[in-house]
Amino acid sequence: KIDACKRGDVTVKPSHVILLGSTVNITCSLKPRQGCFHYSRRNKLILYKFDRRINFHHGHSLNSQVTGLPLGTTLFVCKLACINSDEIQICGAEIFVGVAPEQPQNLSCIQKGEQGTVACTWERGRDTHLYTEYTLQLSGPKNLTWQKQCKDIYCDYLDFGINLTPESPESNFTAKVTAVNSLGSSSSLPSTFTFLDIVRPLPPWDIRIKFQKASVSRCTLYWRDEGLVLLNRLRYRPSNSRLWNMVNVTKAKGRHDLLDLKPFTEYEFQISSKLHLYKGSWSDWSESLRAQTPEEEPTGMLDVWYMKRHIDYSRQQISLFWKNLSVSEARGKILHYQVTLQELTGGKAMTQNITGHTSWTTVIPRTGNWAVAVSAANSKGSSLPTRINIMNLCEAGLLAPRQVSANSEGMDNILVTWQPPRKDPSAVQEYVVEWRELHPGGDTQVPLNWLRSRPYNVSALISENIKSYICYEIRVYALSGDQGGCSSILGNSKHKAPLSGPHINAITEEKGSILISWNSIPVQEQMGCLLHYRIYWKERDSNSQPQLCEIPYRVSQNSHPINSLQPRVTYVLWMTALTAAGESSHGNEREFCLQGKAN
């Protein structure tokens, strides 16, 4: 009932708690002398369901049969309406609609750890929408019985607060849960188990790893477990991997040797425990141990390449380049690279340690046979040296690859293709494709990139360090023993018309013709590989079409003669540059008048 109900009563039959689909009778009755001031025909009793009027009656009592109530709680309130006055609340009642509990299913019990307490869970089934009490009963040997009740509306878990001990691990215990509400009761099927069935060990703790003699091949994992643990599962993985390696061990007694770890790798380790081969359940995984394995000496060999540059009649510059070893080859932090340069006939050798760079430049005499060896060193040792005999890589013309082409292949890729050299193609031991940004000054500081290709390949896709709208000088080398031949080409992955034209910096007269000199277009404005320059000229103040001369682009060229100008005529001259995508805007305009004699 709600409020004090001083003026009347609301009665509910058969009960305030009903089964879904049942009919309920609600009666609202006024107490004596609690009606309207005038005679009772003017009493209007109104029954509300929440905020809606659902029935009314003129008189001292109202009877209403209510059907179709939804699951849950419905509030009914009875009010009295008299002429010319507000409604007066008489009384009210809540009706609870629900269902009898279903049989609890999947009752299962667990004790976490040997010192833990027994707790059980079950599935309640559909919601009863009513206050439902759950009673969990556990019976064991010697007629021992424990019972626990739960009055939570959503109860599906109870902890007995008792600890099963391993004195008689095969003794049987039986658990049962019973649900009771106003509409009925139901019990689960009994669940029978032993100590070994339900004790779930605590996860292992205090996990450590030791590497004997700082070697990855002598690695032992240690941990602590509860006393009765028989089985362990170990799982481990490199920290950057999603896949676990799994190992099952029996009677490990808190230690296990791991034989397949990679050096210089951070691993994550976890361990789980179980009391019995086929009974009970695994513990949760332990907290992760993260540890880095020790270094081992590098494996593999460095990929080394070089460039030669003529300095003068007696000296040449050698630039060596090498690629970092992969993580799996380096097997540790590379501390330095050891470069040894040796003159093969005289036996002179010099060794240098390089840190922080993957290149080295030196000047050597042009005479003699020179070889280099490069290796990588970490704290445990060095990789096998890569040995290279320094030769003229482009000296053997017959070894030069033919018909080299470079074509854009999607975003920031260039496909380089070639034909084998004319000289016996089977003599080729490997091809090397080299590329670097084209700089008109032939700047040797520009990074060099290369890749090696098997002798039967006639194409290579280059993608490393390739930028859009940049022109690359690409060389393909064919190597055979101590000989090499090469061919080169310019290529870009993406191009558009240059942003500006060349800047004419001088026009000079020479024997009746003129020589035009210009400054190169800045690299960042070339927008790809230049194919041609165009020189335009026309008579000043003339509306005629300009004449033009097209010159194939060569990196080093920055002047060109023109001999078709008339003497004593003032001309306006300008230049443009072209890529495969189109022509640039005009460069600067210059005026010039040829002083030579007229014909």
Epitope: R52, R53, I54, H58, G68
Partner: nanobody, 125 residues
Framework: QVQLQESGGGLVQPGGSLRLSCKAS????????MSWVRQAPGKGLEWVSA????????DYADSVEGRFTISRDDAKNMLFLQMNSLKAEDTARYYC??????????????????WGQGTQVTVSS
């Protein structure tokens, strides 16, 4: 589902009479108080009359008191409205509804989907 089907409307002269009927289905008719409601052209819903679930108590709007009589036949799931001394201002479409959906207190339009098409009453000379 709840269905209400009104009938009996028509054209009548001022002072004349009509008897409206409502056939109910899809719910336990006898346990529900019922109402008649009307809507004149361009106006809102106006509650007209109600009868309780036993049929022992009735209520009327002041505008129809003494002229209209509400009744029910629970055996046939029927609700009736006898309209006498009709006036031009009684012209409207008449609907029957559960009292909980439309009472002398308020109409809950969210339940209007349960209502029938109504029956048109026109009072005109």
């Amino acid at each position: 589902q709840v269905q209400l089907q009104e009938s009996g409307g028509g054209l009548v002269q001022p002072g004349g009479s009509l008897r409206l009927s409502c056939k109910a289905s899809g719910f336990t008719f006898s346990t529900y108080a019922m109402s008649w409601v009307r809507q004149a052209p361009g106006k809102g819903l106006e509650w007209v009359s109600a009868i309780n679930s036993g049929g022992l108590s009735t209520d009327y709007a002041d505008s129809v008191e003494g002229r209209f009589t509400i009744s029910r036949d629970d055996a046939k799931n029927m609700l009736f409205l006898q309209m006498n001394s009709l006036k031009a201002e009684d012209t409207a479409r008449y609907y029957c509804a559960k009292y909980e959906d439309c009472s002398d207190y308020m109409c809950h339009r969210d339940r209007a989907g349960y209502w029938g098409q109504g029956t048109q009453v026109t009072v005109s000379s």
